[in-house]
Interface confidence: low
């Protein structure tokens, strides 16, 4: 069971990143699915290595004082959402914006029907060029 | 099937990074090989988790305006090269240069004879001290 | 065999990061253990994917000139410690400090009784908020 999906620009104002099965994507079988273009949902309980990479372009003067944060989050059936992993990068002083890349990854137990998704502080800053931003998992 | 190789400084002007089976490297068997010191080639079709880490030292004034970009690329037999993953970091204002580290990783299907390699915008900026820059894969 | 442990603030002056089985941690069985809150120790020989993520907050003026370095280190029975992976990030000019995240990961052969741990140049700069700093491994 494995998946690798590719970032997609979205006009939605939500902080949850959008993904697509496009380009050189992976979807090994129907035991993992991309739901609503926003979350990877697994059908089998087990340990999974889950990862995300986010490249963004921001400028200190044009952004809020708070850093750019990417969060890998879990929603299990009947449970509250929870943060699994986070990374934070202070905005660049480069103009018009400075690019930076974040990589998250870790081993977590998922229940049947559990979904994982990626949140960012400002989706408009995310880079969607080939290979820059992606999201995936593999079952151990 | 798994491999982990270690960066090697090169006098070549190519943007493809060079690697060696040295230090605490891994080469599990002959189903994965390091070819010409530049690419990991697999003999078996399947899903692989492929990763690379690149540490570099650059300065904004001494570098081009474009950011430092590391790309994980795929060359399959009879196909064009393609980019699997990229990460970008704007150059530091630190002098003489500021160090930054990039990590790339994802799950991809590889065909028999497929090769993966790592490209960077400026190989002269890459750090080759122990553990700073490495490249590997594992078959799921 | 898999583990994922969560960072813990420590009053110790050591550069070795401290970890805990808390929050959404993973400890698959007793073939991998967290020893003294500082190292993951495995009982079985084999290839392991080992990873660490460290988020830190630092300022160029308040820090030493040297960059912030995170190192993934190995201690095998009867052998000297050795560095497996390192990442380096120059300190931010943001005030009071600028956050940055580092991710390390690679495939390594571990012997029975081998331990892996994470070293940083300044543990007081490490961020311990939910999901920011973690450490783990999985046996291939």
């Amino acid at each position: 069971i494995a998946a690798h999906v590719i970032s997609e620009a979205s006009s939605k104002t939500t902080s949850v990143l959008q993904w697509a099965e496009k380009g050189y994507y992976t979807m090994s079988n129907n035991l993992v699915t991309l739901e609503n273009g926003k979350q990877l949902t697994v059908k089998r309980q087990g340990l999974y290595y889950i990862y995300a990479q986010v490249t963004f372009c921001s400028n200190r003067e044009a952004s809020s004082q708070a850093p750019f944060i990417a969060s890998l989050c879990l929603k299990s059936p009947g449970r509250f959402e929870r943060i699994l992993l986070r990374a934070a990068n202070t905005h660049s002083s480069a103009k018009p914006c400075g690019q930076q890349s974040i990589h998250l990854g870790g081993v977590f137990e998922l229940q049947p029907g559990a979904s994982v998704f990626v949140n960012v502080t400002d989706p408009s800053q995310v880079s969607h060029g080939t290979g820059f931003t992606s999201f995936g998992l593999l079952k151990l | 099937i798994a491999a982990h190789v270690i960066s090697e400084a090169s006098s070549k002007t190519t943007s493809v990074l060079q690697w060696a089976e040295k230090g605490y490297y891994t080469m599990s068997n002959n189903l994965v090989t390091l070819e010409n010191g530049k690419q990991l080639t697999v003999k078996r079709q399947g899903l692989y988790y492929i990763y690379a880490q690149v540490t570099f030292c650059s300065n904004r004034e001494a570098s081009s305006q474009a950011p430092f970009i590391a790309s994980l690329c795929l060359k399959s037999p009879g196909r064009f090269e393609r980019i699997l993953l990229r990460a970008a970091n704007t150059h530091s204002s630190a002098k003489p240069c500021g160090q930054q580290s990039i990590h790339l990783g994802g799950v991809f299907e590889l065909q028999p004879g497929a090769s993966v390699f790592v490209n960077v915008t400026d190989p002269s900026q890459v750090s080759h001290g122990t553990g700073f820059t490495s490249f590997g894969l594992l078959k799921l | 065999i898999a583990a994922h442990v969560i960072s813990e603030a420590s009053s110790k002056t050591t550069s070795v990061l401290q970890w805990a089985e808390k929050g959404y941690y993973t400890m698959s069985n007793n073939l991998v253990t967290l020893e003294n809150g500082k190292q993951l120790t495995v009982k079985r020989q084999g290839l392991y994917y080992i990873y660490a993520q460290v988020t830190f907050c630092s300022n160029r003026e308040a820090s030493s000139q040297a960059p912030f370095i995170a190192s993934l280190c190995l201690k095998s029975p009867g052998r000297f410690e050795r560095i497996l992976l390192r990442a380096a990030n120059t300190h931010s000019s943001a005030k009071p400090c600028g956050q940055q995240s580092i991710h390390l990961g690679g495939v390594f052969e571990l012997q029975p009784g081998a331990s892996v741990f994470v070293n940083v140049t300044d543990p007081s700069q490490v961020s311990h908020g939910t999901g920011f700093t973690s450490f783990g491994l999985l046996k291939l």
Epitope: G23, T130 | S15, P67, I69, C73, I83, N119, T121 | -
Partner: nanobody, 128 residues
Framework: EVQLVESGGGLVQPGGSLRLSCAAS????????IGWFRQAPGKEREGVSC???????SYTDSVKGRFTISRDNAKNTVYLQMNSLKPEDTAVYYC??????????????????????WGQGTLVTVSS
């Protein structure tokens, strides 16, 4: 605004030659990979050739030895020199690029979904 404009197409006899041009505006072409694609009537669009920011090139097997891609950074233009043309080369030829705040390094790709910006195309007809 990023724009690509192809020119140089036309009717040519088998064995003849044409030189296609792809003129870029709105960005500095030398920083990016450029791909040439073609779409024959009733067929899917396919990659023909590409050139990276550093000048490395790739070609699909059916055109190797006959087609040559090149770039003139001063003119912000990429060329496709097509020699020994065959009837099966008949198609609309497009150039495309992916200028996403940074360049692609030495690699280039002719998978069409990798490219964000496309020209309007130029028709090449090889017939006696």
């Amino acid at each position: 605004e990023v724009q690509l404009v192809e020119s140089g197409g036309g009717l040519v006899q088998p064995g003849g030659s044409l030189r296609l041009s792809c003129a870029a505006s709105g960005f500095t072409l030398e920083y990016y990979a450029i791909g040439w694609f073609r779409q024959a009537p009733g067929k899917e669009r396919e990659g023909v050739s590409c050139i990276s920011s550093e000048g490395s090139t790739s070609y699909t097997d059916s055109v190797k030895g006959r087609f040559t891609i090149s770039r003139d950074n001063a003119k912000n233009t990429v060329y496709l020199q097509m020699n020994s043309l065959k009837p099966e080369d008949t198609a609309v030829y497009y150039c495309a690029t992916d200028p996403d705040r940074g360049f692609l390094g030495s690699s280039c790709d002719t998978q069409s979904h990798q490219y964000d910006y496309w020209g309007q195309g130029t028709l090449v007809t090889v017939s006696s």
